[in-house]
């Protein structure tokens, strides 16, 4: 707290700005004003990242208005140094109190390649597995010191469930955070609205990103499912193909079974929906069999789970490789 | 020019500076520093990209230093007006001349978003139509008064042909910028480097693309075609599916064709090239054919282009709705 | 794939002359790109010596213009560095490349595994 | 001329760290957005190699380990993590300008 018997300064930092194309000038100028204070001895400072600067300032010389001083402290710096993102303080030292203004260049107004996305529960999860979770995706993050913060909110105002997070450093550099956050089957099929909002140092605003039940029009897949023939040179193997069409909503899973055994998922490859030329949606599936499976069991089960199927969300299709036989 | 009897001022705007932590603060104050000039009538205005503002400023008394007199004029404005991009001049009239600067946000510094990509020739064009062409593709881009430039090179240092530019603002509010550049069809299968280099004021650096032939083993499609059966509810319809696997490298094109005619590429569905097991790649296509076509003639050919499928790179399959009759 | 081949190094005496060449198979040079000499004395750092470009232009570093020539030979498919007045200073690995063109910038993309100048008496 | 400076001349460090080299230009080498710097690797007997291409490229078959940085006189080369076969001189080159030089080397040893 100050005594009575003099008026603290108010230290303010301006900056040069840039031109009336945008473009930041070859040098930057910061000018630390500090003002309204009763005429005394004042020391200033300057701080990058917090440590002092060993530079020679322009410091204006001291003007009197009234009974109140200022001054002024101009500090130059390359475009490169400001651009580096680091932080820049004016120290002012008067009557043994220490008063201070900081800046940094302005994080990017519009940060377009942070984007974020919320999946809804793959209906696999929903409706077999009954432990449907959503997941919070936050992509092309730069790096910072700052943290990422995902949280999770319902429309409804009731409690979530306690989240997980994965952070990735991607081969270009960038950050990818996830959140996965478990949700009620009853909840989701009852239309819950979830929302996941993300903060960031560096974002000028938070990031919404919403989810619920898609609404619409409801429509089982049919599935076809098709073998290749031998083909010359891979006798061993063999190609089975599954389309799934005309389904609505696009929300979908696909399994493989061999043995009434569904087959892991890096063993098949299956596509994003697509549209019709309808109104509703297709998928392809494709997975590659050996000779020792089909000749163990010949016959391979493309199964689809989706909403509107019925009985029990699923529909499929078995195919054997040589089905004469 | 100014008469030798008196010294015309320097302009210079100032901007209130973000926090510590880059944040912009919820208003900007622009300060108009007018200095250096005889005394004399000032008259300050402050334009908003080239209109004369109807404002309120805070215009400080001038000061004088020995001979020459300075002026400062204040602008207050809203942290949604700052990041709208808008340009801020502050115009001096004095003995009959006009001085001014001018300011905007500076322009995002890391503008992640911006992406440029450049394809290789279809398959199609090479081979078959045998004029292929290369597009230089930039997305993500703010829509701004800077130009876009695309500028094509050629590894060989050989002239480049005359390239076709197309500009498409998305509805998000980005701009999205084509160039397509011809080239030679043996000056690429030769192995020709082609370079894209995209510059754009708001891009702190120029973005560089090359494209050139893939390098690497070659494998021709495998192609296979399958009909859907009947399916309650669609009699006058049905689906076709066409499975290409295993070829390299991934560069395909694949069309559909009924009585000797290529139909039209918005009437089939085909994926992007994925990666099977192996070392190759697959892609399925779809394509809804009606009654009409099939009673008319109940062949359907899926047909692939790719280099290394022999003879003329191309290699197909038919298929028929009904194949017993 | 393009390669590059030199010969002609070895030992010669000051003030001595000598004639390296650089056999290109894969590519021809007339086609494109600009070809180049670099060299590395014993033990040292790069410099770039002369170019000649696919349509018969040349360039040389200002160190050794009026010394050395670089000429080509269209049917053999081949470039040369003419190497003339040879001092101590020459001697050095010289190896010859295939430069990459970028909007009228060069760098230096293909080499060959070099030859071994040595000016000495 | 245009001179480039690298630092450190050589440098001793072990499978797994994180190496960074610095190339320093007498004047700038960046024009209309582009930077003209390029990193070679050359290993004893051998022809040089490129790695990156106008400051930050890295080229067709280079490990993502590689990366450059930098732009008008201030430059970096680093290799995120150091394999065996990293082991090698660095130059850096500058093809701004007429006549094309080269840093003078940096020598990555074994610690």
């Known amino acids: 707290v100050c005594s009575r018997d003099f008026t603290p300064p108010t230290v303010k930092i301006l900056q040069s700005s840039c031109d009336g194309g945008g473009h930041f000038p070859p040098t930057i100028q910061l000018l630390c004003l500090v003002s309204g204070y009763t005429p005394g001895t004042i020391n200033i400072t300057w701080l990058e990242d917090g440590q002092v600067m060993d530079v020679d300032l322009s410091t204006a010389s001291t003007t009197q208005e009234g009974e109140l001083a200022s001054t002024q402290s101009e500090l130059t710096l390359s475009q490169k140094h400001w651009l580096s993102d680091r932080t820049y303080t004016c120290q002012v030292t008067y009557q043994g109190h220490t008063f201070e203004d900081s800046t940094k260049k302005c994080a990017d107004s519009n940060p377009r390649g942070v984007s974020a996305y919320l999946s809804r529960p793959s209906p696999f999860d929903l409706f077999i597995r009954k432990s449907p979770t959503i997941t919070c995706l936050v992509v092309d993050l730069a790096p910072s010191k700052g943290t990422v913060n995902l949280t999770w909110s319902r429309a409804s105002g009731k409690p979530v469930n306690h989240s997980t997070r994965k952070e990735e450093k991607q081969r270009n550099g960038t950050l990818t955070v996830t959140s996965t956050l478990p949700v009620g089957t009853r909840d989701w099929i009852e239309g819950e609205t979830y929302q996941c909002r993300v903060t960031h140092p560096h974002l000028p605003r938070a990031l919404m990103r919403s989810t619920t039940k898609t609404s619409g029009p409801r429509a089982a897949p049919e599935v076809y499912a098709f073998a290749t023939p031998e083909w010359p040179g891979s006798r061993d193997k063999r190609t089975l193909a599954c389309l799934i069409q005309n389904f609505m909503p696009e929300d979908i899973s696909v399994q493989w079974l061999h043995n009434e055994v569904q087959l892991p998922d890096a063993r098949h490859s299956t596509t994003q929906p697509r549209k019709t030329k309808g109104s509703g949606f297709f998928v392809f599936s494709r997975l590659e069999v050996t000779r020792a499976e089909w000749e163990q069991k010949d016959e391979f089960i493309c199964r689809a789970v989706h909403e509107a199927a019925s009985p029990s969300q699923t529909v499929q299709r078995a195919v054997s490789v040589n089905p004469g036989k | 020019v100014c008469s030798r009897d008196f010294t015309p001022p320097t302009v210079k705007i100032l901007q209130s500076s973000c926090d510590g932590g880059g944040h912009f603060p919820p208003t900007i104050q622009l300060l108009c520093l007018v200095s250096g000039y005889t005394p004399g009538t000032i008259n300050i205005t402050w334009l908003e990209d080239g209109q004369v503002m109807d404002v309120d400023l805070s215009t400080a008394s001038t000061t004088q230093e020995g001979e020459l007199a300075s002026t400062q004029s204040e602008l207050t404005l809203s942290q949604k007006h700052w990041l709208s991009d808008r340009t801020y001049t502050c115009q001096v009239t004095y003995q009959g001349h006009t001085f001014e600067d001018s300011t905007k946000k500076c322009a995002d510094s890391n503008p992640r978003g911006v992406s440029a990509y450049l394809s290789r020739p279809s398959p199609f064009d090479l081979f078959i139509r045998k004029s292929p062409t290369i597009t230089c593709l930039v997305v993500d881009l703010a829509p701004s008064k800077g130009t876009v430039n695309l500028t094509w090179s050629r590894a060989s240092g050989k002239p480049v042909n005359h390239s076709t530019r197309k500009e498409e603002k998305q509805r998000n509010g980005t701009l999205t910028v084509t160039s397509t550049l011809p080239v030679g069809t043996r000056d690429w299968i030769e192995g020709e480097t082609y370079q894209c280099r995209v510059t754009h004021p708001h891009l702190p650096r120029a973005l560089m693309r090359s494209t050139t032939k893939t390098s690497g083993p070659r494998a021709a499609p495998e192609v296979y075609a399958f009909a859907t059966p009947e399916w309650p509810g669609s009699r006058d319809k049905r689906t076709l599916a066409c499975l290409i696997q295993n070829f390299m490298p991934e560069d395909i094109s694949v069309q559909w064709l009924h009585n000797e005619v290529q139909l039209p590429d918005a009437r089939h569905s085909t994926t992007q090239p994925r990666k099977t097991k192996g070392s190759g790649f697959f892609v399925f296509s779809r394509l809804e054919v009606t009654r009409a076509e099939w009673e008319q003639k109940d062949e359907f050919i899926c047909r692939a282009v790719h280099e290394a499928a022999s003879p003329s790179q191309t290699v197909q399959r038919a298929v028929s709705v009904n194949p017993g009759k | 794939e393009v390669q590059l081949v030199e010969s002609g190094g070895g030992l010669v005496q000051p003030g001595g002359s000598l004639r390296l060449s650089c056999a290109v198979s894969?590519?021809?040079?007339?086609?494109?790109?600009?070809w180049e000499w670099i060299r590395q004395a014993p033990g040292k750092g790069l410099e770039w010596v002369a170019s000649i470009h696919y349509d018969g232009s040349t360039n040389y570093n200002p160190s050794v213009k009026g010394r050395i020539t670089i000429s080509r030979d269209d049917s053999k498919n081949t470039f040369y560095l003419q190497m003339n007045s040879l001092r101590a200073e020459d001697t050095a690995v010289y190896y010859c490349?295939?430069?990459?063109?970028?909007?009228?910038?060069?760098?230096?993309?293909?080499w060959g595994q070099g030859t071994l100048v040595t000016v000495s008496s | 001329d245009i001179q480039l400076t690298q630092s450190p001349s050589s440098l001793s460090a072990s499978v797994g760290d994180r190496v960074t080299i610095t190339c320093r230009a007498s004047?700038?080498?960046?024009?209309?957005?582009?930077?003209?710097m390029n990193w070679y690797q050359q290993k004893p007997g051998k022809a040089p190699k490129l790695l990156i291409e106008w400051g930050s490229y890295l080229r067709s078959g280079v490990p993502s380990r590689f990366s450059g940085s930098g732009s008008g006189t201030d430059f970096t080369l680093t290799i995120s993590s150091l394999q065996p076969e990293d082991f090698a001189t660095y130059y850096c080159?500058?093809?701004?300008?007429?006549?094309?030089?080269f840093g003078q080397g940096t020598k990555v040893e074994i610690k």
């Open positions: 894969g590519y021809s040079i007339t086609s494109g790109h600009r």
């Open positions: 004047q700038s080498v960046d024009y209309h957005g582009d930077s003209y």
């Open positions: 490349a295939r430069a990459t063109h970028y909007f009228g910038h060069h760098h230096f993309a293909v």
């Open positions: 080159q500058q093809n701004a300008e007429d006549p094309y030089t």
